[in-house]
């Protein structure tokens, strides 16, 4: 299986609420012997590998924020200290999954990073992630909402988050 | 704050079988493999395997499949290796660790003593 | 299985100087291998965790680099504090396999 970043960059104004999405693509084992953990963090673009290095996401770590169950089950994030943080990161039947943060600052920008790894009895793990680029602008030249730019594998142009 | 808490020494007979605990606190137990790693004085750390809690999926080193057994209970937020037909070869630090999928073994036990001795 | 060789088992050194620790994985690994510190009467302590990058905490005198099959593990200076075994390990497939421990000792 793949992870696929439907946006690449998300550009919003500070204040704004955003939602950065990733998707789980390919073949995926429902069978009760196989389960995922998805899960969000911050990072750096690494000489070697993007998404090597694991920050936290406002104090709260990749651990804090992960998802675990099998197949394309539906999760939420364990609710009190995420949205304590502002924070809910989700996960629906179809393999998408996604972090939403709310009232964006200044400090939020940067390179973010989802995770997904197979998990199979027997078996080594099987771990895949994606990147995105988050911007929060503040003054004249920040959007009104939410700006977000398709990988390059998609259409160019650029879409407006609704 | 994450924690792992481990049953405290023994003194086993050869033949025998033991049990030790590691009990977690301070996150979400199903949620992360306990790792069990074996330390014997002059021969570094050696990795026994991993349980994964409330799966129940677990890896063993081949070379430790026939002689440790781990299980794991969600109700208390315990794993549990089981040492069987102890010799002295077993004697030694037994640690527990906590790993994230698709991470390192970032908490560790206070390590349990075995000395195996007739 | 993945063999991770530690070619010094001791090293020597004084306050304040930078040492270095290699480490070798018999394949490749690109750079799923961390470095942990075990104290004298302690249980191990991740410190560098992916070959470079430091885990919450660890000061900044600890560093890591390689890729591939050959790590080094740097402290920039060395503080008493700091005698201890120190070990690389692999996180690339199971079976997980540690190095044989390089333990620093404080001249």
């Known amino acids: 299986f793949k992870v696929a970043t439907p946006y690449s960059l998300y550009v919003c104004p500070e204040g704004q609420n955003v939602t950065l999405t990733c998707r789980l693509l390919g073949p995926v084992d429902k069978g009760h012997d196989v389960t995922f953990y998805k899960t969000w963090y911050r990072s750096s673009r690494g000489e070697v590998q993007t998404c090597s290095e694991r920050r936290p996401i406002r104090n709260l770590t990749f651990q804090d924020l992960h998802l675990h169950h099998g197949g394309h089950q539906a999760a939420n994030t364990s609710h009190d200290l995420a949205q304590r943080h502002g924070l809910e990161s989700a996960s629906d039947h179809h393999g998408n999954f996604s972090i939403t943060m709310r009232n964006l600052t200044l400090l939020d920008s940067g390179l973010y990073c989802c995770l997904v790894v197979e998990i199979r009895h027997h078996h080594s793990e099987h771990r895949v992630h994606g990147a995105m680029e988050l911007q929060v602008q503040t003054g004249k030249d920040a959007p009104s909402n939410c700006v977000v730019y398709p990988s390059s594998s998609q259409d160019s142009e650029n879409i407006t988050a609704a | 704050q994450v924690q792992l808490q481990q049953s405290g020494a023994e003194l086993m007979k050869p033949g025998a079988s033991v049990k030790i605990s590691c009990t977690a606190t301070?996150?979400?137990?199903?949620?992360?493999?306990i790792e069990w790693v074996k330390q014997r004085p002059g021969h570094g750390l050696e990795w026994l395997g991993e349980?994964?809690?409330?799966?129940?999926?677990?890896n063993y080193n081949e070379k430790f499949k026939d002689k440790a057994t781990f299980t794991a209970d969600t109700s208390s937020d315990t794993a549990y290796m089981q040492l069987s037909s102890l010799t002295s070869e077993d004697s030694a630090v037994y640690y527990c660790?906590?790993?994230?999928?698709?991470?390192?073994?970032?908490?560790w036990g206070a390590g349990t003593a075995v000395t195996v001795s007739s | 299985d993945i063999v991770m060789t530690q070619s010094h088992k001791f090293m020597s050194t004084s306050v304040g100087d930078r040492v270095s620790i290699t480490c070798k994985a018999s394949q490749d690994v690109s750079t799923d291998i961390a470095w942990y510190q075990q104290k004298p009467g302690q249980s191990p302590k991740l410190l560098i965790y992916s070959a470079s990058y430091r885990f919450t905490g660890v000061p900044d005198r600890f560093t890591g680099s390689g890729s591939g099959t050959d790590f080094t593990f740097t402290i920039s200076s060395v503080q008493a504090e700091d005698l201890a075994v120190y070990y690389c390990?692999?996180?690339?497939?199971?079976?997980?396999?540690f190095g044989g421990g390089t333990k620093l000792d404080i001249k």
């Open positions: 660790a906590r790993r994230p999928p698709g991470w390192y073994f970032d908490v």
């Open positions: 349980i994964l809690p409330g799966s129940d999926y677990t």
């Open positions: 390990q692999h996180q690339y497939s199971t079976p997980w396999t």
């Open positions: 301070g996150y979400t137990f199903s949620s992360c493999w």
